[in-house]
Interface confidence: medium
Amino acid sequence: PRSIDVKYIGVKSAYVSYDVQKRTIYLNITNTLNITNNNYYSVEVENITAQVQFSKTVIGKARLNNITIIGPLDMKQIDYTVPTVIAEEMSYMYDFCTLISIKVHNIVLMMQVTVTTTYFGHSEQISQERYQYVDCGRNTTYQLGQSEYLNVLQPQQ
């Protein structure tokens, strides 16, 4: 087993706004990670880099630095937010996301995250990829794990 375990838990919330003129959707997506330190010494979570893809196009990126220190045999839950923009060649999605006749406007996004930890004099990078449902039609708060998109493309834990 890894001495550092990173588990992508899921989307915590998604807040939506629109630019009617530009037919653009802005989605602020907050994700949750569990990082477990299985060592007998503290490790530093140096940075988290994340990106979100829709239909194989990167629609948002984020980076957090100097995040936290995790004690021996301890776990921390970390939330990080990725601002995303669905626009231009994907502006056709604006019609779907603002359609009043349907209640839930779920789109499938691919969440990619890389956690860099430092300990014992070296850095270790651990990456995760998950497909998630996000409602682009309203502000939504999710139960952890509720937004998971189970699909053959979904990488195994």
């Epitope: 060592n39 007998y40 010494y41 004690g71 021996p72 045999l73 776990m75 300990y119 004099g121």
Partner: antibody, heavy 120, light 112 residues
Framework: QVQLQQSGAELIRPGTSVKVSCKAS????????IEWVKKRPGQGLEWIGV????????NYNEKFKGKATLTADKSSSTAYMQLSSLTSEDSAVYFC?????????????WGQGTTVTVSS | DIVVTQTPLSLPVSFGDQVSISCRSS???????????LSWYLHKPGQSPQLLIY???NRFSGVPDRFSGSGSGTDFTLKISTIKPEDLGMYYC?????????FGGGTKLEIK
């Protein structure tokens, strides 16, 4: 003062399981790790595993994986070790001890030990 | 796993003697932060093990100054300057740096 009070001696039938307790007092329970150690007559000390009572995260000696299960109850400041599928090889004295998170102090205070005898 | 080799297995002594017990690990016990988790314990029959030395050379509270620890990296020594009757028993070193923690095989300090 720091004390680790362990449960009493156990006489157990082979194939069954036993749960040994270790009640901590005199310090902040979740600020220290709890270690478990085995001592058989005529043999040396054997490290079983360790638990962080605050997070519940454990680390085991490979030899004791599937044999020992470590848990902790923060509300009662008590750590537990369950031993399953007992055989005569599990007859031993089992000790709990605490270790400091931050300093290099490993197993500074120890429980009095719990004797487990496996016999039919 | 880290192998911790303790020598000698048995140490016959007379009261007043000075003795050394050696502990050697298969890998360095110093971590990135410069900490070395190497402890020494005395275990007497019918009692709980008692911590004597931690972090190579730090005496635990209440431990007499006739006990001293030294060493670095992979080689460590426990010295007892003047043996007293209460010092008889099994001595163990423990490495706590790497997973899993491992004890040395023990050294029996007994009267000649």
């Amino acid at each position: 003062q720091v004390q680790l009070q362990q449960s009493g001696a156990e006489l157990i039938r082979p194939g069954t399981s036993v749960k040994v307790s270790c009640k901590a007092s005199g310090y902040a329970f979740t600020n220290y790790l709890i270690e478990w150690v085995k001592k058989r007559p005529g043999q040396g000390l054997e490290w079983i595993g360790v638990i962080n009572p605050g997070s519940g995260i454990t680390n085991y000696n490979e030899k004791f994986k599937g044999k020992a299960t470590l848990t902790a109850d923060k509300s009662s400041s008590t750590a537990y070790m369950q031993l399953s599928s007992l055989t005569s090889e599990d007859s031993a004295v089992y000790f709990c001890a605490r270790s400091d998170f931050i300093t290099t102090v490993v197993a500074d205070y120890w429980g009095q030990g719990t004797t487990v005898t496996v016999s039919s | 796993d880290i192998v911790v080799t303790q020598t000698p297995l048995s140490l016959p002594v007379s009261f007043g003697d000075q003795v050394s017990i050696s502990c050697r690990s298969s890998q360095s016990l110093t971590n990135y932060y410069g900490n070395t988790y190497l402890s020494w314990y005395l275990h007497k029959p019918g009692q709980s093990p008692q911590l004597l030395i931690y972090g190579i050379s730090n005496r635990f509270s209440g431990v007499p100054d006739r006990f001293s620890g030294s060493g670095s990296g992979t080689d460590f020594t426990l010295k007892i300057s003047t043996i007293k009757p209460e010092d008889l028993g099994m001595y163990y070193c423990l490495q706590g740096t790497h997973q899993p923690r491992t004890f040395g095989g023990g050294t029996k300090l007994e009267i000649k």
